[in-house]
Interface confidence: low
């Protein structure tokens, strides 16, 4: 007699939504061998039994997870082979926060992996990398796990977040850190990586002081071309924090992003504007200090932001977000900059 299982591995990892067939067969000198799968949580419709063989079809659903056993018998002889099936989900859906790091200050960095299964700390690991090495001095905080809100029931996917306390980045600051998430499965290791760019001064590693109007730039592989205004401030489009939700935001030149302009009609005011077609809205999502202390007007594809009471704009980073799509544009305003009537 010969007893064979194909594929022969005792542990098989199957990506959610993909299919796999496991064939168990046995030849028998004395008539037809009895071959069947047992220990199945899945419906019996996923097993096709033929004379001398049995085919288990795994459909890449979470309900396929388990350890079925193929039992083959021929006369008084019997054989068994167990296959541990693990269905996993690990899409490239990493979201990092903040979108960029500022040198010279302590900060908390978070990295979230979305739509994960299994949500097991033993399977999933996070690392904060500088180049190819783990960043020294970063303190990993307790990871968080939460069930994702799913459109379809019966698919309990999770999001897992790792946070780090990050001490002040040294000088010169590195161009970027990376969050790396690794899923370790039987005989399979999967890795996704997301860049967290670090702000760099164009002239000096030091952050700008109150008398300097030198702009900061983001050094990031995903940084788009900066757009300058007459105030000598720089807008810095950054990569979308998650996959785009609408094909309307796509173009051959990359995603359409909001633009930030200076508006002098009513004192010191910033205007964020989207020109990506109908149905797009913009809103201010970040400003130095508390965003609630600013005067905001939001009207569809335009959003204004001004200081209350009217006066010079506060030094720091401003961010405008566009929906759908989630693309953001960042603007750094150096200290002691007053509006110039000749600016456009």
């Amino acid at each position: 007699q010969s007893f064979q299982v194909n594929p022969p591995e005792s542990e098989v990892a199957v990506a959610m939504g993909t299919s796999l067939q496991i064939t168990c067969s046995m030849s028998c000198d004395e008539g037809v061998a009895r071959v069947h799968w047992r220990g199945l949580d899945t419906s019996l419709g996923s097993v096709q039994t033929l004379p001398g063989s049995s085919i288990l079809s795994v459909r890449g659903m979470l309900s396929d997870t388990g350890t079925p056993v193929c039992v083959g018998s021929c006369g008084s002889r019997s054989f068994q082979h167990s296959v541990k099936i693990l269905v996993y989900a690990f899409p490239d859906q990493l979201v990092v926060s903040p979108e960029f790091l500022v040198p010279g200050q302590d900060q908390v960095v978070s990295c979230t992996a979305h739509n994960i299964w299994p949500a097991d700390p033993n399977s999933l690991s996070f690392a904060l990398l500088l180049g190819e090495q783990r960043l020294e001095g970063a303190q990993a905080l307790e990871p968080e796990q939460e069930e994702e809100i799913q459109e379809a029931e019966g698919t309990p996917l999770f999001r897992m977040t790792q946070r780090w306390r990050l001490p002040s980045l040294g000088t010169p600051a590195p161009p970027a850190l990376h969050c790396q998430v690794t899923m370790q499965l039987p005989k399979l290791v999967l890795t996704h990586r997301k860049e967290i760019p670090v702000l760099q001064s164009q002239t000096s590693p030091k952050p700008p002081n109150t008398t300097s109007a030198e702009p900061y730039i983001l050094t990031s592989s995903s940084t788009a071309e900066a757009v300058s205004t007459g105030l000598n401030i720089t807008t810095l489009p950054s990569a979308p924090p998650y996959p785009k939700l609408s094909p309307r935001t796509l173009s051959s030149e990359g995603p359409c992003r909001p633009k930030i302009h200076q508006d002098l009609e009513a004192g010191w005011e910033l205007l964020c504007e989207a020109s990506c077609g109908p149905g797009v809205t913009v809103r201010w999502t970040l400003a130095p200090g508390d965003l609630a202390t600013y005067h905001k007007r939001e009207a569809g594809a335009q959003a204004w932001l001004s200081v209350l009471p009217p006066g010079p704009m506060v030094e720091g980073w401003f961010q405008c977000r566009q929906d759908p799509g989630g693309e953001v544009t960042n603007l750094y305003v150096p200290g002691q900059v007053t509006p110039n009537s000749s600016s456009t």
Partner: antibody, heavy 118, light 107 residues
Framework: EVQLLESGGGLVQPGGSLRLSCAAS????????MHWVRQAPGKGLEWVSS????????DYADSVKGRFTISRDNSKNTLYLQMNSLRAEDTAVYYC???????????WGQGTLVTVSS | DIQMTQSPSSLSASVGDRVTITCRAS??????LAWYQQKPGKAPKLLIY???SLQSGVPSRFSGSGSGTDFTLTISSLQPEDFATYYC?????????FGQGTKVEIK
């Protein structure tokens, strides 16, 4: 909620017969292998018999082969164990159990006591 | 038949103790092993399956390890409700067989 409820135990003379039943509820009975496991007073657990979801695959422990018959009625969500030619060593609490994954039992009934004595 | 041998047969321990029970199979059974807890007059309760997978709802202080012929059940910090008898069970080949049990008693 998954529930397994055995019945049919009692006192019987050696050589006599009993039929145990196990009523299942709270899950799709017809999708699971079911087993009988017994435990003699003060002793350990002993696997007795198993039956496949459709009833086509049946196995017995050597100690009961030829005397016990396992069966199931999926329309009634019930598992049976027909015990003939009972012996004193068959005295035990009989549990029905649901098998999942790698032939382990995630749910058990509360047990029914079978006493074989003259 | 595959024989399953548990050791020790009984042990006395205190609340908070780390307890280890071993189970040895007479031949290799891969990871086809389960652990059960049984209290007097009650049905067994599944703790561990596949040698190391924790059954849903079972406290994380229970853990299982091993493969082939040697297996271990560990209770990291014994609680009052853990005093019971523990059984291993092989599910690699027929007939399924259980260990003789390990009784965990209060010291």
């Amino acid at each position: 909620e998954v529930q397994l409820l055995e019945s049919g135990g009692g006192l019987v003379q050696p050589g006599g017969s009993l039929r145990l039943s196990c009523a299942a509820s709270g899950f799709t009975f017809s999708s699971y292998w079911m087993h009988w496991v017994r435990q003699a007073p003060g002793k350990g657990l002993e696997w007795v018999s198993s039956i496949s979801p459709g009833g086509s695959n049946i196995d017995y422990a050597d100690s009961v082969k030829g005397r016990f018959t396992i069966s199931r009625d999926n329309s009634k969500n019930t598992l049976y164990l027909q015990m003939n030619s009972l012996r004193a060593e068959d005295t035990a609490v009989y549990y029905c159990a649901r098998e999942v994954q790698l032939s382990h039992y995630d749910y058990w009934g509360q047990g029914t006591l079978v006493t074989v004595s003259s | 038949d595959i024989q399953m041998t548990q050791s020790p047969s009984s042990l006395s321990a205190s609340v908070g103790d780390r307890v280890t029970i071993t189970c040895r199979a007479s031949q290799g059974i891969s990871n086809s092993l389960a652990w059960y807890q049984q209290k007097p007059g009650k049905a067994p309760k599944l703790l561990i399956y596949g040698a190391s997978s924790l059954q849903s709802g079972v406290p994380s202080r229970f853990s299982g390890s091993g493969s082939g012929t040697d297996f271990t059940l560990t209770i990291s910090s014994l609680q009052p409700e853990d005093f019971a008898t523990y059984y291993c069970q092989q599910a690699n080949s027929f007939p399924f067989t259980f260990g003789q049990g390990t009784k965990v008693e209060i010291k």
